[in-house]
């Protein structure tokens, strides 16, 4: 794995422990919480990042309307079970034997049940809508410039191929970034849209996951883009299964 060889750190994940105990004395980094080896040349999976976070000490309408099946992460943080590849296991349970099914970004997609609950497969989140509201500025941003800057950010910082950034919508002060990635489209080595969205979310909140780098300084033609609210909607390849009680609540 590529890590900064000189001081043996993980540029893409500060929630790691690194030591030169890899093959040939190479720097090897392991995620906190899981102890799993991570590839420091790319983004760490959201599951391993959440696990590490839980183990750390506690301290005209152009905009898209999310579909009725869109999920929002209302459950917040939990200590997830990850598979050997670092992906979320389809079924997650807490210490009190309450279980639920999650999608590929770890968001609950069923009602909670007991240990008998079955989650047959990990359902892929293929469409993510990142809804941002920026702080007031002298004037609206130029849509084309904003589009280019956000695409550049996802390409260069999060290594997401631009073909997975389906659209950038803007209706001052709301910005929406649509990420789309079908299973058939995702090749080996491609960053997952769920991981890119999570890194972006943490950057926007001033909680960068990158090692020793300054926080995100987003500018459009030199004008700072400061986000004051973020909402993320997740759409799965198979709609979620919630009881009517939840849907009418």
């Amino acid at each position: 794995h590529t890590a900064a060889q000189d001081n043996c750190t993980c540029p893409t994940n500060k929630m790691t422990v690194c030591s030169p105990d890899g093959p040939g004395g190479r720097c090897q980094c392991r995620a906190l919480g899981s102890g799993m080896a991570v590839d420091c040349s790319t983004l760490t999976s959201k599951c391993l990042l959440l696990k590490a976070r839980m183990s750390a000490p506690k301290n005209a309408r152009t905009l898209v309307r999310p579909s009725e099946h869109a999920l929002v992460d209302n459950d917040g943080l939990y200590d997830p079970d990850c598979d050997p590849e670092g992906r979320f296991k389809a079924r997650q349970c807490n210490q009190t034997s309450v279980c639920w099914c999650v999608n590929s970004v770890g968001v609950r997609r069923t009602d909670k049940g007991d240990l008998s609950l079955r989650c047959d497969e990990l359902v892929r989140t293929h469409h993510i809508l990142i809804d941002l509201r920026h702080r007031p500025t002298a004037g609206a941003f130029n849509h084309s410039d904003l589009d280019a800057e956000l695409r550049r950010l996802f390409r260069e910082r999060y290594r997401l191929h631009p073909k997975f950034v389906a659209a950038v919508h803007y209706e001052q002060p709301t910005i929406q970034i649509e990420l789309r990635q079908n299973t058939s489209q995702k090749a080996a080595g491609d960053v997952d849209i769920g991981d890119a969205a999570y890194y972006f979310e943490r950057d926007i909140k001033g909680e960068s996951l990158f090692q020793g780098r300054g926080g995100l300084d987003l500018r459009v033609r030199g004008e700072p883009l400061q986000v004051e609210r973020t909402l993320i909607y997740y759409l799965d390849e198979i709609p979620p299964k919630f009881s009517m009680k939840r849907l009418t609540a």
Epitope: T12, R151, R152, R155, E156, P162, R180
Partner: antibody, heavy 118, light 111 residues
Framework: QVQLQQSGAELVRPGVSVKISCKGS????????MNWVKQSHAKSLEWIGV????????NYNQKFKGKATMTVDKSSSTAYMELARLTSEDSAIYYC???????????WGQGTSVTVSS | DIVLTQSPVFLAVSLGQRATISCRAS??????????MHWYQQKPGQPPKLLIY???NLESGIPARFSGSGSRTDFTLTINPVEADDVETYYC?????????FGGGTKLEIE
């Protein structure tokens, strides 16, 4: 304004290596990846690879693996490409080009001519 | 690799007329409504210069005489009206899939 300044022409013997440079100015160097492109009479334009100036690692065209090695020096805003074990097939003009919107190549260096001759 | 075939290889047009250059990809270069096809102009002794990105978006500073169109596998660069300064070689390039590839080029001449 954005500028990519490449090193001068090279006349080299077969079997040796050559390292060419590309210095970026007029923009934040680590905000954009840097492509390298080969232009020869026989093959038109060929993409050699791209280096992430943010991460410092490179992605190569399979055809140029083992032939080209890309590096970056963030402190001097300079990208480098070393070509190894040169043959007459490597005689060409080599361009650096900034990775732009939708992975286009929006700014190009003036080119470095490499001539391999005994 | 995605192969890009440009036609014609040579194109002769009169000043003030329309020039149309075609680029055909061996497979689709579209993703969610975005076409990963770009056009460049190259003058002798100079590097290529980006004219059009994402099939139809005019790069900043490029005259509106240049336009691009197309989707999936078939793309067109149009110059209307042609001026004397446009007598150059034009290339298409796809960035949908690695490795990015270029067309073989179209040389524009004045008849």
């Amino acid at each position: 304004q954005v500028q990519l300044q490449q090193s001068g022409a090279e006349l080299v013997r077969p079997g040796v290596s050559v390292k060419i440079s590309c210095k970026g100015s007029g923009y934040t160097f680590t905000d954009y990846g840097m492509n390298w492109v080969k232009q020869s009479h026989a093959k038109s334009l060929e993409w050699i690879g791209v280096i992430s100036t943010f991460y410092g690692d490179a992605n190569y065209n399979q055809k140029f693996k083992g032939k080209a090695t890309m590096t970056v020096d963030k402190s001097s805003s300079t990208a480098y490409m070393e070509l190894a074990r040169l043959t007459s097939e490597d005689s060409a003009i080599y361009y650096c080009a900034r990775r732009g919107n939708y992975d286009s190549m929006d700014y190009w260096g003036q080119g470095t001519s490499v001539t391999v001759s005994s | 690799d995605i192969v890009l075939t440009q036609s014609p290889v040579f194109l002769a047009v009169s000043l003030g007329q329309r020039a149309t250059i075609s680029c055909r990809a061996s497979e689709s270069v579209d993703s969610y409504g975005n076409s990963f096809m770009h056009w460049y102009q190259q003058k002798p002794g100079q590097p290529p210069k980006l004219l059009i990105y994402r099939a139809s978006n005019l790069e900043s500073g490029i005259p509106a005489r240049f336009s691009g169109s197309g989707s999936r596998t078939d793309f067109t660069l149009t110059i209307n009206p042609v001026e004397a300064d446009d007598v150059e070689t034009y290339y298409c390039q796809q960035s949908y899939e690695d490795p990015p590839t270029f067309g073989g080029g179209t040389k524009l001449e004045i008849e």
